[in-house]
Interface confidence: low
């Protein structure tokens, strides 16, 4: 499974969307975990609602929020107020009993915001939202303000 590299600005929100086969993963909860080392275990950060039909409701653990659109086959994780310590390797997982299937591996990189740099002459202009196989990311363009996706119809 390829690892997707996502970059977010410190102090801003980074949103990750992991897509999956809605039928294959029918009835399964999803989780976002942080991998401890290249081959180490994956430590659960947050998981979707215990009642699968309520998976669309946002579940929060600290500054990390998860919600699952089980019809569209998209689980969305938002890392709010991104800090340098949030950098690292993560996984989107689909839970089946005690087993966890990896949906997507994500390497989160945290960039310093040039706007915080007194010497920065140019304003930082975010790149267009990048998309890739299996996951999507959106950056919020103003600090501490989350850009929300339009609801899935």
């Amino acid at each position: 499974l390829n690892t997707t590299v996502l970059q977010g600005m410190a102090g801003q929100s980074l949103r990750v969307s992991c897509t999956y086969d809605a039928l294959k993963h029918w009835g399964r909860r999803k989780a976002w975990c942080r991998q401890l080392g290249e081959e180490g275990p994956c430590q659960r950060v947050v998981s979707t609602h215990g009642v699968w039909l309520l998976a669309f409701l946002k579940k929060r653990n600290g500054s990390t929020v998860i919600a699952d659109d089980t019809l569209a086959g998209t689980v969305t994780i938002t890392l709010k107020n991104l800090q340098a310590g949030d950098a690292g390797l993560y996984q989107c997982q689909s839970l089946r009993g005690r087993e966890a299937e990896v949906l997507q591996k994500v390497l989160v990189e945290v960039l310093e915001d040039p706007l915080d740099d007194q010497d920065a002459g140019d304003l930082w202009v975010p790149e267009e939202s990048s998309s890739f196989e299996g996951a999507q990311v959106e950056h919020s363009t103003s600090r501490n303000q989350e850009t929300s996706f339009p609801p899935t119809s």
């Epitope: 039928l23 669309f56 089980t70 899935t152």
Partner: antibody, heavy 119, light 108 residues
Framework: QVQLVQSGAEVKKPGASVKVSCKAS????????MSWVRQAPGQGLEWMGV????????VYAQKFQGRVTMTRDTSISTAYMELSRLRSEDTAVYYC????????????WGQGTLVTVSS | DIQMTQSPSSLSASVGDRVTITCRAS??????LAWYQQKPGKAPKLLIY???SLQSGVPSRFSGSGSGTDFTLTISSLQPEDFATYYC??????????FGQGTKVEIK
């Protein structure tokens, strides 16, 4: 026992809208997705879309995007399908159908609602 | 969209006959296929899901097989109440779920 009871037959003029209801009983309404399927006279079955009764999230078949709206009222265990800008070719029997979690195939169906579009 | 092609479109058979209906998908749908029976003026009834799983309450003379693109519904010994139209339905790809065009089973 599980029952899906649909509203009665409708006659509409082209360009109008129709809203069909489907009242569920005999099971927990919010525990199953609800789908809608239609069948034109003498023709086959055509899938229209699906709604999650808990969240209200929907997925529509591409053919009906922009014309169909599926909603629900959990307080009365009822799902609704509204089709707008009706044309004569929308004349059909419209079925609601329950989707269990062990498969995405529809296990219980409503009795059907005949919608006739005629000027 | 995925096309589901059923064959034959109609067939005549006698009570006690073994009847086979086939359904071919235009692309791989794994085992996400269901079979329905519909009688005139009635709603369809689920017979088989996941290609080969028999729905509760359905007689064991009905069976399904296949995976990928080719699927079969078999009625081992046709009964009078089995004369109806049968539809296959693929639910592997959303939102382009599609039914086959139907197979009408008539009395010979």
């Amino acid at each position: 026992q599980v029952q899906l009871v649909q509203s009665g037959a409708e006659v509409k003029k082209p360009g109008a809208s129709v809203k069909v209801s489907c009242k569920a009983s005999g099971y927990t309404f919010t525990g199953y997705h609800m789908s809608w399927v239609r069948q034109a006279p003498g023709q086959g079955l055509e899938w229209m879309g699906v709604i999650n009764p808990v969240s209200g999230n929907t997925v529509y078949a591409q053919k009906f995007q922009g014309r169909v709206t599926m909603t629900r009222d959990t307080s009365i265990s009822t799902a609704y399908m509204e089709l707008s800008r009706l044309r004569s070719e929308d004349t059909a029997v419209y079925y609601c159908a329950r989707i269990p979690s062990y498969t995405y195939a529809f296990d219980y169906w409503g009795q059907g609602t005949l919608v006739t579009v005629s000027s | 969209d995925i096309q589901m092609t059923q064959s034959p479109s109609s067939l005549s058979a006698s009570v006690g006959d073994r009847v086979t209906i086939t359904c071919r998908a235009s692309q791989d749908i794994s085992n996400y296929l269901a079979w329905y029976q519909q009688k005139p003026g009635k709603a369809p009834k689920l017979l088989i899901y996941r290609a080969s799983s028999l729905q509760s309450g359905v007689p064991s003379r009905f069976s399904g097989s296949g995976s990928g693109t080719d699927f079969t519904l078999t009625i081992s010994s046709l009964q009078p109440e089995d004369f109806a139209t049968y539809y296959c339905f693929q639910y592997r790809h959303m939102p382009s779920q599609t039914f086959g065009q139907g197979t009408k089973v008539e009395i010979k």
